[in-house]
Structures are given as C-alpha cells and as structure tokens.
Interface confidence: low
C-alpha cells in the first residue's frame, strides 16, 4: 500500500478560499499534503 503514518485530517484555509493563483503558485503546505494522504490512505 501507500505506507506512511496516519495523520489527523487537517483543515487548510487555502482549501476554502482558493484563487487561480493560490493553488498553482503557492507552495503546497506540509499540512495540505498530510491531509490528502490521510484521506487517500483512510479511504481504502
């Protein structure tokens, strides 16, 4: 499987207040990446 430890499902303000610039031109935050992996690992 994907490996990696489980993380709490983080909320990220960028997710709700996204602009064209913010998703592609700001660096992906560490919390953001953890959140996605938590969701995908947890969905199996």
């Amino acid at each position: 499987g994907g490996g990696g430890s489980k993380h709490k499902c983080f909320r990220n303000s960028l997710e709700n207040n996204e602009t064209l610039e913010s998703i592609m031109n700001t660096l992906e935050s560490e919390e953001d990446f953890r959140k996605y992996f938590y969701y995908l690992e947890g969905s199996k």
Epitope: G2, G3, G4, S5, L14, E15, I23, M24, L27, E28, E30, D32, F33, K35, Y36, F37, Y39, L40, S43
Partner: antibody, heavy 118, light 112 residues
C-alpha cells in the same frame, strides 16, 4: 525557470535493474510532492508513483509495486526511481512531474527512455 | 481503480473551428473536501505532456483562454473555442482524486 530533467534511461535486460533520476531547479523542491509517469511507445500515460514533499509518504501503481521504489534527496533537489526485476512491459518513456496541491501534475520533465530487451 | 474513458478518440478539426472532447469516469471524482480533481493535459507530437486545466475548469498559467473545461461528478468536457495549428496533439484527462491516479486513453486532435 522551473525545470525538471530526467536521466538514467537506457537499454537493460529483463530481470535487471535501472535507476532513474530527476534533477529539479527553479522552485523549492522540498515543498512539493513528486511523481513518476510513464508512456509506452505509441501508447497512453500511466501513473507510476508519488512521493510526498518530505519523503515519508509513497504510493505506487499495482503494476510496479514491490519492484520499483521512489526516493528523493531534498538537499540535492533530486528525485529517484529504482526499478528492479524489469520486464518487457516496463519499456516506456519515464517522466517526472511536480505535484501541486491536490496532486495536480503541473510541471513535467522531457522524459527518459527505458528499453527492456534481451 | 477509477477507469477514465474519452470520446472521441480522434477528432479531425478545421482551423478556426471549435472542438470538444468528453471524459467520463467510472465513479464520482468528488473528494470529501468538496473538490473534484480532474485535469486536462495536452501532448504535442514529440513533446512531454503539459497541464492545461486543473480541478475541472481552472486554466493553468500561460494556457490560452480558447481552452475551457466544464463538468461535474463523472462527466467532463474540454472545449477549444477556435482550433489553431499549435493545438494539434493528444489530449488526456486525468483524475487525482483516488489512488491509483488514472488517465483517459487520449484524444488525438489534428487538422482536416
């Protein structure tokens, strides 16, 4: 400018190993997840693997699971794909790609060709 | 795995005329965060893929506004309002909602 350059492709016999590398420049490499995607000659795209920004999370396509490993060296801005037990069906151009938020593959390298042949 | 299908697989178009490509997923691409992770990529002959559209309808930086994306759930469309010579190539849809990430088979766009 933002750039990804793959290397390490070549001709290898079935069952042997090959290590691909991807050199990143023009962005903060340590802040992005990175992917490998491959494309067999004349065929479509197949996602291979992803590694998180810190290297702690990895995920693989079933077709390569247990044979390929993905790693990164953030101090050298380098992504690697170690390919073991290569098969004829692994013959493809291998692209590295940057993963933006939501795993959007926004920047792609030019690719490196891997040929598996006896 | 989520299976992505595209129609048509080949689309001969006239310069200056519109073109439309459909992409369908075998299950909904809406993730629990409310976002739909459907992208469109262009691959010109002899070139690597290039991101055009992300999250259904958002144009990536530098992509001409003649490209637009729409859709929801399992059905998505890429439209080119007026095809130019540089638009020749293969167009792929891709989902990054669920592992393993998967691509459509591609639609070849060429000039009549």
């Amino acid at each position: 400018q933002v750039q990804l350059v793959e290397s390490g492709g070549g001709v290898v016999q079935p069952g042997r190993s090959l290590r691909l590398s991807c050199a990143a420049s023009g962005f903060t490499f340590s802040s992005y997840g990175m992917h490998w995607v491959r494309q067999a000659p004349g065929k479509g795209l197949e996602w291979v693997a992803v590694i998180s920004y810190d290297g702690n999370n990895k995920h693989f396509a079933d077709s390569v699971k247990g044979r390929f490993t993905i790693s990164r060296d953030n101090s050298k801005n380098t992504l690697n794909l170690q390919m073991n037990s290569l098969r004829a069906e692994d013959r493809a151009v291998y692209y590295c790609a940057r993963g933006a938020s939501g795993f959007v593959l926004d920047i792609w390298g030019q690719g490196t060709m891997v040929t598996v042949s006896s | 795995d989520i299976v992505m299908t595209q129609t048509p697989l080949s689309s001969p178009v006239t310069l200056g005329q519109p073109a439309s490509i459909s992409c369908r997923s075998s299950q909904s691409l809406v993730r629990s965060d409310g976002n739909t992770y459907l992208s469109w990529l262009q691959q010109r002959p002899g070139q690597p893929p290039r991101l055009l559209i992300y999250k259904i309808s958002n144009r990536f930086s530098g992509v001409p506004d003649r490209f637009s994306g729409s859709g929801a759930g399992t059905d998505f469309t890429l439209k080119i309002s007026r095809v130019e010579a540089e638009d020749v190539g293969i167009y792929f849809c891709m989902q990054t909602t669920q592992f393993p990430f998967t691509f459509g088979p591609g639609t070849k766009v060429d000039i009549k």
